[in-house]
């Protein structure tokens, strides 16, 4: 028996369902009574789901997994993982035993988009050219860790005096806070871009200083 899986990682959004594809080629006359299918976490060998002795033994993984029972006899051994969590990320092994056996591993990459950044200034009044200001860009509930980029109004990257922190919450999602310290010119726009490297999703936020008063562009 030869097991085949997708070589590319499966990307799944948090709280959605993912299908880990796995297939084998049944011989003529194959019956489910001959099939032993085991899904497990590759690294820890923790059992996830199994079909043995001619029946679905069910989920051994927080009751969020299912096979496709009607498709098994055709050689479809794929696993459905419901309500994906950050902790589900990793490699899963699909093991198929009929007379002989084979196995293959498929990777699950979990992702969550970052929210549109909110921008804050400190201080936020009585600003004069030459003042040092702190601009904070905050974006929430993303995964995996973001890449943060700052630019001025001319699109020139601002790399000095940037401090970025990323904190995971109880669900494993990251809240990003990036702080830019700049000396104000007469006027200017400062923008931050929060990129999710897996989803290739960019979330933009900006603040424009036009002498007095300061204005924030409307939310898009």
């Amino acid at each position: 028996v030869e097991v085949q899986v997708s070589e590319d990682p499966v990307v799944a959004l948090v709280d959605t369902d993912a299908t880990l594809r796995c297939s084998f080629s049944p011989e003529p006359g194959f019956s489910l009574a001959q099939l032993n299918l085991i899904w497990q976490l590759t690294d820890t060998k923790q059992l996830v789901h199994s079909f043995t002795e001619g029946r679905d033994q069910g989920s051994a993984y927080s009751n969020r997994t299912a096979l496709f029972p009607d498709l098994l006899v055709q050689g479809n051994a794929s696993l459905r993982l419901q309500r994906v969590r950050v902790t589900d990320e990793g490699s899963y092994t699909c093991f198929v035993s009929i007379q002989d056996f084979d196995s293959a591993a498929v990777s699950l990459q979990v992702a969550a988009p970052y929210s549109k950044p909110s921008m804050t200034l400190e201080p936020n009044k009585d600003l004069r050219p030459g003042n040092m200001v702190t601009i904070t860009c905050s974006s929430y509930q993303g995964y995996p860790e973001a890449e943060v980029f700052w630019k001025d109004g001319q699109g020139v990257p601002l790399t000095g005096n940037v401090t970025t922190s990323q904190m995971a919450n109880e669900r494993g999602l990251f809240d990003v806070h990036s702080v830019l310290r700049v000396v104000l010119g007469a006027n200017g726009t400062y923008s931050c871009l929060v990129r999710n490297p897996v989803l290739q999703q960019d979330a933009h936020g900006s603040v424009t200083i036009t002498g007095q008063p300061l204005t924030f562009p409307p939310e898009a």
């Epitope: 032993n36 497990q40 060998k45 002795e53 092994t93 093991f95 035993s97 007379q99 056996f101 196995s103």
Partner: antibody, heavy 117, light 109 residues
Framework: QVQLVQSGAEVKKPGSSVKVSCKAS????????ISWVRQAPGQGLEWMGG????????NYAQKFQGRVTITADESTSTAYMELSSLRSEDTAVYYC??????????WGQGTMVTVSS | EIVLTQSPGTLSLSPGERATLSCRAS??????LAWYQQKPGQAPRLLIY???NRATGIPARFSGSGSGTDFTLTISSLEPEDFAVYYC???????????FGQGTKLEIK
Amino acid sequence: QVQLVQSGAEVKKPGSSVKVSCKASGGTFSSYAISWVRQAPGQGLEWMGGIIPILGTANYAQKFQGRVTITADESTSTAYMELSSLRSEDTAVYYCARWGGGAFDIWGQGTMVTVSS
Amino acid sequence: EIVLTQSPGTLSLSPGERATLSCRASQSVGGYLAWYQQKPGQAPRLLIYDASNRATGIPARFSGSGSGTDFTLTISSLEPEDFAVYYCQQRNNWPPMYTFGQGTKLEIK
């Protein structure tokens, strides 16, 4: 070409334990199933137990349950069989064998274990 | 637990003759049956798997047949090197457990 090379002969006292190794070369060890089969002098073949390294689980013949432990080290492509509480009846040649293509297609050369006081 | 019974215990034949070895299972094993040859001081050698498929490098004079509970290994014309002990073996479906028959000794008459 896959080969299984076993550790050398052992002489043990009754009540002690023996650990025999079986090193695989060629192929992908984690996708093997390795069994241990013994043969007492002048007797037939007796399956003791086996392990599928990729699953990390071993299972044993009822006769040996509790007395035999089979393990595998994927990093060195080596399977081990440890038999405890040895008695004279355990004197035998111990073989490791790979399950592949519907049968034990590759066998180690055998390890003679003699239990004698 | 499935028990495999081989018969006869000893078979005495001459080179060139046809040998028929039997293996009976206490319950159906489907087609999951293998045959091995073992010579003194050597490890067993796989001859037949899945009841009737010859293993790589096994001469055509060896053939296997049967399904369910009754299986036969036939050697069409015995060569001097064929005199040895022959074992049948089955695999339980899951978890994988294996059983050997007690063996048939094929000796020169």
